[in-house]
Interface confidence: low
């Protein structure tokens, strides 16, 4: 529609009491340069006066000077392209609709931007990949819909409450498309990390806790097995009996099949967690292990070397 002014800015901005809000904004007026600008809070059009009513957070005076009482709110733009705003500090009662009343030589426009100010710092949001597999590098992302030049923050990663050793990369966006702070952590989880709690903690510049988000790691891994043998030294005489037991210490997802291998070859019809060898013979000497599979793949126990000696 050629009769409209063109604006680009985030639709909604988020902040909390005492922080600040930086509103990136560009515009193009219908007929050249901007003449005057008023920033309203929750503007309402008054049909009787044909003007907008509402709290004026900022008003550009005719000579471009900013009255000292308006310094909390700053217009950082210009008369032709930029309508960037800063509110520092921002207060809970600033929540609502900001109305940018723009007047050029012959045209007028009211542009609305939503501001959501919470009482306390809101938590970041941890984003995990759809699936995490052991030993495969993944990127953990912590996203906070906040960034402001006048209020530095930091995002810290914790594993079971302990700062993670891996170096995180923090980036910020303060553009007309998006406003956020993001921390990305490259991490190669081990099976032992399954079920552990990862925290992304929002802190102020001094490291003071502001808020956090937590997730429980769901690390897909092959079954982790322990093999036990009786007798424990796995040295027997011909005719003796040997029992091997396979224990699953961890499997995610649940295991589906069990098998036993001797010298790398599967033993037929041995599909339980206990392998009973009765009246062993010399040729049953060798390396035994159990193999348990799940959807990720097979897991093998350590090998037990069974020595069958002559009677």
């Amino acid at each position: 529609d050629s009769s409209k002014w063109v604006f680009e800015h985030p639709e909604t901005l988020y902040a909390w009491e005492g922080a600040c809000v930086w509103i990136p904004c560009t515009y193009r007026a219908l007929d050249g340069d901007l003449e005057s600008f008023i920033l309203f809070h929750n503007p309402e059009y008054n049909k009787n006066t044909s003007k907008f009513d509402g709290t004026r957070l900022y008003e550009s005076t005719k000579d471009g000077k900013v009255p000292s009482e308006q310094k909390r709110v700053q217009f950082l733009g210009d008369k032709n392209k930029n309508c960037t705003l800063s509110i520092h500090p921002v207060h809970l009662n600033d929540s609502g609709q900001l109305g940018l009343r723009m007047e050029s030589k012959t045209e007028k426009w009211m542009e609305r931007i939503h501001l959501n100010v919470s009482e306390r710092p809101f938590p970041p949001h941890i984003q995990l990949p759809p699936e995490i597999q052991e030993s495969q590098e993944v990127t953990l992302t912590c996203l906070l819909n906040f960034s402001c030049y006048g209020y530095p923050i930091q995002l810290q990663w914790l594993l079971e409450g302990v700062p993670m050793r891996q170096a995180a990369v923090t980036s910020t966006s303060l553009t007309i498309k998006s406003v956020f702070t993001r921390s990305e952590l490259k991490f190669s989880p081990q099976w032992s990390h399954h079920g552990k709690i990862v925290t992304c903690q929002l802190q102020d510049a001094d490291g003071k806790f502001l808020s956090n988000d937590t997730v429980q790691l769901n690390v897909k891994h092959t079954p982790k097995l322990e093999i036990k043998v009786t007798p424990s030294d796995a040295i027997v005489r011909e005719g003796d009996s040997v029992t091997m037991t396979c224990e699953v210490s961890s499997s995610n997802p649940e295991y589906t099949t069990v098998s036993w291998l001797k010298d790398g070859t599967s033993l037929k019809k041995q599909n339980t967690f206990t392998l009973n060898l009765r009246e062993v013979t010399k040729d049953q000497s060798g390396k035994y292990c159990c193999q348990v599979s799940n959807d990720v793949g097979p897991g093998r126990s350590e090998e037990v070397f069974l020595q069958v000696q002559y009677a």
Epitope: L34, E35, K62, F75, K79, K81, N82, K105
Partner: antibody
Framework: EVQLVESGGGLVQPGGSLRLSCAAS????????MNWVRQAPGKGLEWVGR????????NYSGKFKGRFTISADTSKNTAYLQMNSLRAEDTAVYYC?????????????WGQGTLVTVSS | DIQMTQSPSSLSASVGDRVTITCRSS???????????LEWYQQKPGKAPKLLIY???NRFSGVPSRFSGSGSGTDFTLTISSLQPEDFATYYC?????????FGQGTKVEIK
């Protein structure tokens, strides 16, 4: 300190071309209009046109449209005036001038000027 | 295009004199919001112009108080209340209300 420094002037033959440069420093170049103003020897000032370096938008005085082109390189903080099909009457000192206010139109900073002489 | 016509084209005056330069636009440079983008610039030989007054009557930062601007509609005036030695120069009015922007032809203030 905000500074504008022009360069590129000199002697050029009629019909020739010349590109003037205006190097800006001391402020955010991309967020202020940059104007070109010329002054023929012993004559008055004449507005040529302007550019907004942030996105390259331009406005020209009608008499210069087609022959003169204003451009800018924000990575170099430099504005340019490309002049083609030059005539003797284009002989002048060329100034760049920043439009330095958000609300009031005025040229608060000027370069020192660069002389262009069109002669055979 | 809007023509800006200054008068006189030149004048001779002494230090301490009150000097008045007028500028007339060929059409109104007042827009609907009430602002008038009329400026005055001072230029000395071999130097770049310097801003004195913007929006008819606003003195630019650092400009001595002896310089003042007034006017409305199409008629504008630059006044130097008490001419000083450093004020001998050429003065230009300028309109920035409509494209193309235009300067007056200049008024040269010389020593009597």
């Amino acid at each position: 300190e905000v500074q504008l420094v022009e360069s590129g002037g000199g002697l050029v033959q009629p019909g020739g071309s010349l590109r003037l440069s205006c190097a800006a420093s001391g402020y955010e170049f991309s967020r202020s209009w940059m104007n070109w103003v010329r002054q023929a020897p012993g004559k008055g000032l004449e507005w040529v046109g302007r550019i907004y370096p942030g996105d390259g938008d331009t406005n020209y005085s009608g008499k210069f449209k087609g022959r003169f082109t204003i451009s800018a390189d924000t990575s170099k903080n430099t504005a340019y005036l490309q002049m083609n099909s030059l005539r003797a009457e284009d002989t002048a000192v060329y100034y760049c001038a920043r439009d330095g206010s958000s609300w009031d139109w005025y040229f608060d900073v000027w370069g020192q000027g660069t002389l262009v002489t069109v002669s055979s | 295009d809007i023509q800006m016509t200054q008068s006189p084209s030149s004048l001779s005056a002494s230090v301490g004199d009150r000097v008045t330069i007028t500028c007339r636009s060929s059409q109104s440079i007042v827009h609907s919001q009430g602002n008038t983008f009329l400026e005055w610039y001072q230029q000395k030989p071999g130097k770049a112009p310097k801003l004195l007054i913007y929006k008819v009557s606003n003195r630019f930062s650092g400009v001595p108080s002896r310089f003042s601007g007034s006017g409305s509609g199409t008629d504008f005036t630059l006044t130097i209340s008490s001419l000083q030695p450093e004020d001998f120069a050429t003065y230009y009015c300028f309109q920035g209300s409509q494209f193309p922007y235009t300067f007056g032809q200049g008024t040269k203030v010389e020593i009597k």
